[in-house]
Interface confidence: low
Amino acid sequence: EEELQIIQPDKSVSVAAGESAILHCTITSLFPVGPIQWFRGAGPARVLIYNQRQGPFPRVTTVSETTKRENMDFSISISNITPADAGTYYCIKFRKGSPDTEFKSGAGTELSVRAKPS
């Protein structure tokens, strides 16, 4: 089986306040089995943004059709962006377990928030 890679192609994304931000993430293998999660920030203080196994996450929608069995696109859209949403977002693959354990992280995408156009 191909070794899993997590590709976050955008190093940074800039979005105007009030708009939606699309954060891209694709994976290259279905294995190991386990959910994808998105976090803002790293380390103990990181904030969970999206978890494939939990929810709902009212401001977050998946960009692709995640019901496709071989889906490898876990890009997300975050609506109604505010300055508080600024930060680096990591797409992380977890390995199934009790509990699920972190397997591999993408390189991160930095989200900056511009002032709302007047």
Partner: antibody
């Protein structure tokens, strides 16, 4: 409320064809993969075929590959199963099922009431 | 194929556990997620009780719970009710075979 209503079940002879339909409502049809699951009399559940929501990628159980064709009409929110070269062992209640949004680890969160297909000479 | 007992029984108000094993494994030691379905009578529409091993839909009573260890998953019903008498199917997704189900376990409430 999510509703899945199957139709098209009938009594047919071996070798004949049949087309099942499933009318869906209560959810955005294009956002979800759909499948057919069958249950032979007194038996368990058997997944038959599935189709993804937007790009029509299809999947089949080995037992029906080459004989059955799954398709969907997103404009009509309708799922189809074209069954050719029917055999006695295809006799079953056929359920139309909606896939959940749990990526490729698929679970079926809504089921229709089923339609009975009987293949007998 | 998934393996589960053909039948189990439980006292009204008691606890019953139904096991299911045989989901696929991969070279890295990971395994498939399981779900559980309830069918009240033959030919009636099954209802999903548990998905992702242990997640319960919001409309399913909390007496139903799921847990998984290795390639064995367990459905636990705590405080069994008369209306829980039904056939319970475990299910999973195999990347080569598509969705697969166990043969079903009939629960009798005494």
């Amino acid at each position: 409320d999510v509703q899945l209503v199957e139709s098209g079940g009938a009594v047919v002879r071996p070798g004949e064809s049949l087309r099942l339909s499933c009318k869906a409502s209560g959810f955005t049809f294009t956002n979800f993969a759909m499948s057919w699951v069958r249950q032979a009399p007194g038996e368990g559940l058997e997944w038959v075929s599935g189709i993804s929501g937007s790009d029509d990628t299809t999947y089949y159980a080995d037992s029906v590959k080459g004989r059955f064709t799954i398709s969907r009409d997103n404009s009509e929110s309708t799922l189809y199963l074209q069954m050719n070269s029917l055999r006695a062992e295809d006799t079953a209640v056929y359920y139309c099922v909606k896939d959940s949004t749990v990526s490729w680890n698929t679970f079926f969160d809504y089921w229709g009431l089923g339609t009975l297909v009987t293949v007998s000479s | 194929a998934l393996t589960q007992p053909a039948s189990v029984s439980a006292n009204l108000g008691g606890t019953v556990k139904i096991t299911c094993s045989g989901g696929y494994g991969s070279d890295d030691g990971s395994s498939s997620y399981y779900g559980w379905y309830q069918q009240k009578s033959p030919g009636s529409a099954p209802v999903i009780l548990i998905y992702w091993d242990d997640k319960r839909p919001s409309d399913i009573p909390s007496r139903f719970s799921g847990s998984t260890s290795g390639s064995t998953t367990t459905l636990t019903i705590t405080g069994v009710q008369a209306e829980d008498e039904a056939v319970y199917f475990c299910g999973t997704y195999d990347t080569s075979s598509g969705a697969i189900f166990g043969a079903g376990t009939t629960l009798t409430v005494l």
